[in-house]
């Protein structure tokens, strides 16, 4: 599920990662836009054991998951959340 | 605003089950990233973490506690109680209901506090 | 399990002091260049209330006297000017690694 995610807190991640996660791990995609509190677009997976990871917007494996997503759902948009 | 609320037995005997409820408001269980938990204090102690439960039913119990403690929510009624077998006098405490923040999943905090109940184990 | 060691476990100070207490960790509870460490204030017969949390972010709503700071295992809480509701119990908590635990607390009381 990809979920647009707004928060009061300021930004969630400090460092990023490249590292690939395995969709079958995947439990939810939010991805936090830019100027809400934080200056930066964050991405931030959820993975199922309930750990969460930091994931670099430019890593080309989260881009192509989102994509995928994006066109999965682009009947309806993302469910924001407060 | 966010709500929660003890309620149970003040009073549990010896090797009986201890069960508490915490209701809640403001928030709802099911929402995904969402973890509610309880803590305890014994009389002029410190805090202990018991177990908390997340939005998808998965538990996680503090493994000192772990083969008496059960967590489990009823989303329906806006509900999540916990139940403490075998109790002796050192479980008597203040047992607090609270909600996990919601934002780092098994690295998070408790954001949120019930008033916390009373609990007492004596014949 | 990552023990948390308070210090002081008491301690005296007057309106208008600056007050620090210490938390160190049995081992690093920082992960993502984050450090998860907390702090929470419990007066008596009441329940406990955020501070701070993530090491350093200051919960909503809480005064800017209070602060704090650290990585790794060692990190501090400061009040800058400690006024008459202040005086109360500290307790700092981990989440980086099950089971969450917390210090045993820092008795902040009148001098």
């Known amino acids: 599920v990809l979920e647009v995610y707004y928060t009061h807190l300021r930004c969630r991640c400090v460092q990023e990662s490249s590292v690939f996660i395995p969709r079958r791990f995947i439990d939810r995609i939010q991805i936090s836009p830019r100027g809400n509190g934080c200056p930066r677009k964050e991405i931030i997976v959820w993975k199922k054991n309930k750990s969460v990871v930091c994931v670099d917007p430019q890593a080309e494996w989260i881009q192509r998951i989102m994509e995928m997503l994006r066109k999965k759902s682009s009947s309806t948009p993302p469910v924001p959340v407060f | 605003q966010v709500q929660l609320q003890e309620s149970g037995p003040g009073l549990v005997k010896p090797s009986e089950t201890l069960s508490l409820t915490c209701t809640v408001s403001?928030?709802?269980?099911?929402?995904?990233?969402?973890?509610v938990g309880w803590i305890r204090q014994p009389p002029g102690k410190g805090l202990e973490w018991i177990a908390h439960i997340w939005w998808d039913d998965d538990r996680r119990y503090n493994p000192a506690l772990k083969s008496r403690v059960t967590i489990s929510k009823d989303t329906s009624k806006n509900q999540f109680s916990l139940k403490l077998s075998s109790v002796t006098a050192a479980d008597t405490a203040v047992y607090y209901c609270a909600r996990i923040a919601g934002y780092y999943g098994s690295r998070d905090w408790f954001a949120y506090w019930g008033q916390g109940t009373t609990v007492t184990v004596s014949s | 399990d990552i023990q948390m060691t308070q210090s002081p476990s008491s301690l005296s100070a007057s309106v208008g002091d600056r007050v620090t207490i210490t938390c160190r960790a049995s081992?690093?509870?920082?992960?993502?260049?984050?450090?998860?460490m907390h702090w929470y204030q419990q007066k008596p017969g009441k329940a406990p209330k955020l501070l701070i949390f993530?090491?350093?972010d200051l919960e909503s709503g809480v005064p800017s006297r209070f602060s704090g700071s650290g990585s790794g295992t060692d990190f501090t809480l400061t009040i800058s000017s400690l006024q008459p509701e202040d005086f109360a119990t500290y307790y700092c908590?981990?989440?980086?690694?099950?089971?969450?635990?917390f210090g045993q607390g820092t008795k902040l009381e009148i001098k």
């Open positions: 908590q981990q989440s980086n690694k099950d089971p969450w635990t």
């Open positions: 403001g928030f709802s269980l099911s929402t995904f990233g969402m973890g």
């Open positions: 081992e690093s509870v920082d992960n993502m260049g984050i450090s998860f």
């Open positions: 993530r090491a350093s």
